[in-house]
Interface confidence: low
């Protein structure tokens, strides 16, 4: 899909909050993200019937060091930046905008390369969208069960 490329790794930093957002703000962001994510996933599933989920792609979308789990924006953002060209321009940009609000400035962001093979690429995108939707559900539930 991508053609051959030269690759060298380094993180890229973007403007982001230096402190943790209050739960009410996080809840607002999650509420914004849910319909965007669901719409994107449903749209993709309609277009790409018969594409299986990839067992090689794992979106580490929740932090393991906080209780309740927090959305790991720094881990998610690179995947959405990578699939931007292959999905709905406006929806992906809105998702990135919301994820940027959740990201901490000191957290490094690694670039992700989309699989070169067309079928693998479709599977990769589907998996990211499915796992992200599931993560949002999980975070939303934990936010609702805790203090508002």
């Amino acid at each position: 899909m991508r053609g051959s490329h030269h690759h060298h790794h380094h993180g890229s930093s973007h403007m982001a909050p230096t402190h943790q957002l209050p739960p009410s703000d996080v809840r607002k962001i999650i509420l914004e993200l849910q319909p965007l994510s669901r719409g994107l996933l449903e749209d993709y599933q309609k277009k790409e019937t018969g594409v299986p989920e990839s067992n090689r792609t794992l979106l580490l979308c929740l932090t393991s060091d906080s209780q309740p789990p927090r959305l790991n924006s720094s881990a998610i953002l690179p995947y959405f930046r990578a699939i931007r060209p292959l999905s709905d321009k406006n929806i992906i940009d809105k998702i990135i905008e919301q994820l940027d609000k959740l990201k901490f400035q000191h957290e490094p962001e690694t670039e992700i390369s989309v699989p070169a093979d067309t079928f693998e690429c479709k599977s990769f995108i589907l998996t990211i969208l499915q796992q992200f939707s599931a993560c949002l559900e999980s975070v939303f539930k934990s936010l609702n069960s805790g203090p508002q």
Epitope: R2, G11, H14, M15
Partner: antibody
Framework: EVQLVESGGDLVKPGGSLKLSCAAS????????MSWVRQTPDKRLEWVAT????????YYPDNIKGRFTISRDNAKNTLYLQMSSLKSEDTAMYYC???????????WGQGTSVTVSS | DILLTQSPASLAVSLGQRAIISCKAS??????????MHWYQQKPGQQPKLLIY???NLEAGVPTRFSGSGSRTDFTLNIHPVEEEDAATYFC?????????FGGGTKLEIK
């Protein structure tokens, strides 16, 4: 307002080198992939190189690979194209272009002219 | 490499009429149900400007008289009704595969 201003174009001899720069403003430079596209004297457009938003991934067509190097300095909001082993067929107007992700080129600079001739 | 063939090379259209420009790809440029084909307008002495991205999406600020359609190998740019300011050269470009390639251009003249 998105602005891309190219500089560094010149008349150069075959086999020579040249470095083009593109100063970007009006948008968050480090969030966008960037490309160089050239327009030959007969007005044909040719893609030259692309670099991902953080600089980790670079892409070139086969006729360019090994001769040109695209790079970026996100702290300075600047894109570069280092050109070496220049040939007469590299004569063109070189445009700096903002990318949407990897695939759509939504803003183009005014261009800088490169002439390769003895 | 994917070859893009634009037709016609030039056309003259009366003010208010419809201009249709075709772009044919040597192989499919669709991915995930989307045509990775884009259209640019270039006026004399100016840089190209994005009009339509991914086959049919109108770029922000572009008048609605411009529209794009097509999938796989056949794509079309429609301009209706044509206005004086539309006199320009139009290019298609694919990003389905590297190297990205452009069509040879179609010069539109307004009668």
């Amino acid at each position: 307002e998105v602005q891309l201003v190219e500089s560094g174009g010149d008349l150069v001899k075959p086999g020579g080198s040249l470095k083009l720069s593109c100063a970007a403003s009006g948008f968050s430079f480090s969030n966008y992939g960037m490309s160089w596209v050239r327009q030959t004297p007969d007005k044909r457009l040719e893609w030259v190189a692309t670099i991902s938003y953080g600089g980790s991934y670079t892409y070139y067509p086969d006729n360019i690979k090994g001769r040109f190097t695209i790079s970026r300095d996100n702290a300075k909001n600047t894109l570069y194209l280092q050109m070496s082993s220049l040939k007469s067929e590299d004569t063109a107007m070189y445009y700096c272009v903002r990318g949407y992700g990897y695939d759509t080129m939504d803003y183009w600079g005014q261009g800088t002219s490169v002439t390769v001739s003895s | 490499d994917i070859l893009l063939t634009q037709s016609p090379a030039s056309l003259a259209v009366s003010l208010g009429q419809r201009a249709i420009i075709s772009c044919k790809a040597s192989q499919s440029v669709s991915f995930a149900g989307t045509g990775l084909m884009h259209w640019y307008q270039q006026k004399p002495g100016q840089q190209p400007k994005l009009l339509i991205y991914r086959a049919s999406n109108l770029e922000a600020g572009v008048p609605t008289r411009f529209s794009g359609s097509g999938s796989r190998t056949d794509f079309t740019l429609n301009i209706h009704p044509v206005e004086e300011e539309d006199a320009a050269t139009y290019f298609c470009q694919q990003s389905r595969e590297y190297p990205w390639t452009f069509g040879g251009g179609t010069k539109l003249e307004i009668k």
